[in-house]
């Protein structure tokens, strides 16, 4: 196969998460206890965890989770095949990547199997719930005598889907300098002082071209550049205040 690029994609508007909770329409003789809210996160589009607070149940109850996509050919829910447990009580469900569709409305139903009328349905936009892995393989190189370039890699997810937050500071700085880098896994620092020791770290989020996730990944492992003879010294900061 050969490839050629014809045009670049427009960045369409992305709707925010929609969460709706409802209970069954049956007439109940006694008020039903509300079910805990289900929270779902898609981890690097490798798997998804949907969890709930099982300790909010007055009695130890193995709640069941069923899910489907709004668009699916039949409207039947499928039950979770891989439950997560807390103190031997169901507290979540892990869904594998084959079952993840980011751009279809994900419908999740939590139910008390002992009281079938006690159920809650939520609708989620998974594209806004992606948490990438921390960036990896941070490498520093000199572009010129005083200019540094930092590069990194993301695993599994295309770079165009990611936005990065780069932080750096020298051993003389109290706080981090930070900036957003969109889609390109590189950043250059035009002027560095070779007498200082710099530390860099990066994190990423699935935003804004492919989704609108506000959740950042964990920080990468930090990388360092510069004089290794000067160590960070908190007392120095106090003197400079």
């Amino acid at each position: 196969w050969s490839s050629k690029v014809l045009m670049s994609s427009a960045n369409e508007d992305i709707k925010a998460d929609l969460i709706l909770t409802s209970t069954a329409p049956e007439h109940l003789s006694a008020p039903t206890l509300p079910l805990p809210e289900v929270q779902c996160f898609v981890f690097n589009i490798e798997y998804m965890n949907c969890t709930w607070n099982s300790s909010s149940e007055p009695q130890a109850t193995n709640l069941t989770l069923h899910y489907r996509y709004k668009v699916s050919d039949n409207n039947t829910f499928q039950e979770c095949s891989h439950y997560l447990f807390s103190k031997e009580i169901t507290s979540g469900c892990q869904i594998q990547k084959e079952d993840i569709q980011l751009y279809q409305t994900f419908v999740v139903q939590l139910q008390d199997p002992q009281k079938p009328q006690r159920r809650a349905v939520q609708k989620l936009n998974l594209q806004n719930l992606v948490i990438p892995r921390a960036p990896e393989n941070l490498t520093l190189s000199n572009l010129s005598e005083s200019q540094l370039e930092l590069r990194w890699k993301s695993r599994h997810i295309k770079e165009r889907c990611l936005q990065y937050l780069v932080q750096y500071r020298s051993n003389r700085d109290r706080s981090w300098t930070e900036l957003i880098v969109n889609h390109e896994p590189r950043f250059s620092l035009p002027s560095v002082d070779e007498l200082k020791r710099y530390t860099f770290r990066v994190r990423s989020r699935y935003n804004p071209i492919c989704g609108s996730s506000q959740q950042w990944s964990k920080w990468s492992q930090p990388v360092h550049w510069g004089s290794h003879t000067v160590e960070e010294n908190p007392s120095l900061f106090a003197l400079e205040a």
């Epitope: 490839s3 690029v5 994609s9 751009y103 889907c161």
Partner: nanobody, 128 residues
Framework: QVQLQESGGGSVQAGGSLRLSCATS????????MGWFRQAPGKEREGVAA???????SYADSVKGRFTISQDNAVNTLYLQMNNLKPEDTAMYYC??????????????????????WGQGTQVTVSS
């Protein structure tokens, strides 16, 4: 629900042309990869052409220079213009759609197994 409906197949003499269409609904078209595949009797389904959301296109070597894949986002329709058809192009032609190529690095546009949604197919017969 997701629907893909092919049309435009038929019988044609070698050297002739056909234009296949695939009307789609039920998914955000601008976030999906679309592919044309074909399956001749007794053979495995094979990739013919694919197009990514950004408009990037890929072709099987056997159709390069003869087939053109395109899409009309306004009407959510995929096309395959087939020129200089050969008897070996005879097959059932399917269109397929999937979102994962939009965000996954390791997505292979050529593999039928990567695609989640499929049409019913349209028959193309080329006689010599």
């Amino acid at each position: 629900q997701v629907q893909l409906q092919e049309s435009g197949g038929g019988s044609v003499q070698a050297g002739g042309s056909l234009r296949l269409s695939c009307a789609t609904s039920g998914f955000p078209y601008s976030r999906y990869c679309m592919g044309w595949f074909r399956q001749a009797p007794g053979k495995e389904r094979e990739g013919v052409a694919a197009i990514e959301p950004d408009g990037s296109t890929s072709y099987a070597d056997s159709v390069k220079g003869r087939f053109t894949i395109s899409q009309d986002n306004a009407v959510n329709t995929l096309y395959l213009q087939m020129n200089n058809l050969k008897p070996e192009d005879t097959a059932m032609y399917y269109c397929a759609a999937d979102e994962r190529c939009f965000y996954l690095k390791d997505y292979d546009l050529r593999r039928p197994a990567q695609y989640r949604y499929w049409g019913q197919g349209t028959q193309v017969t080329v006689s010599s």
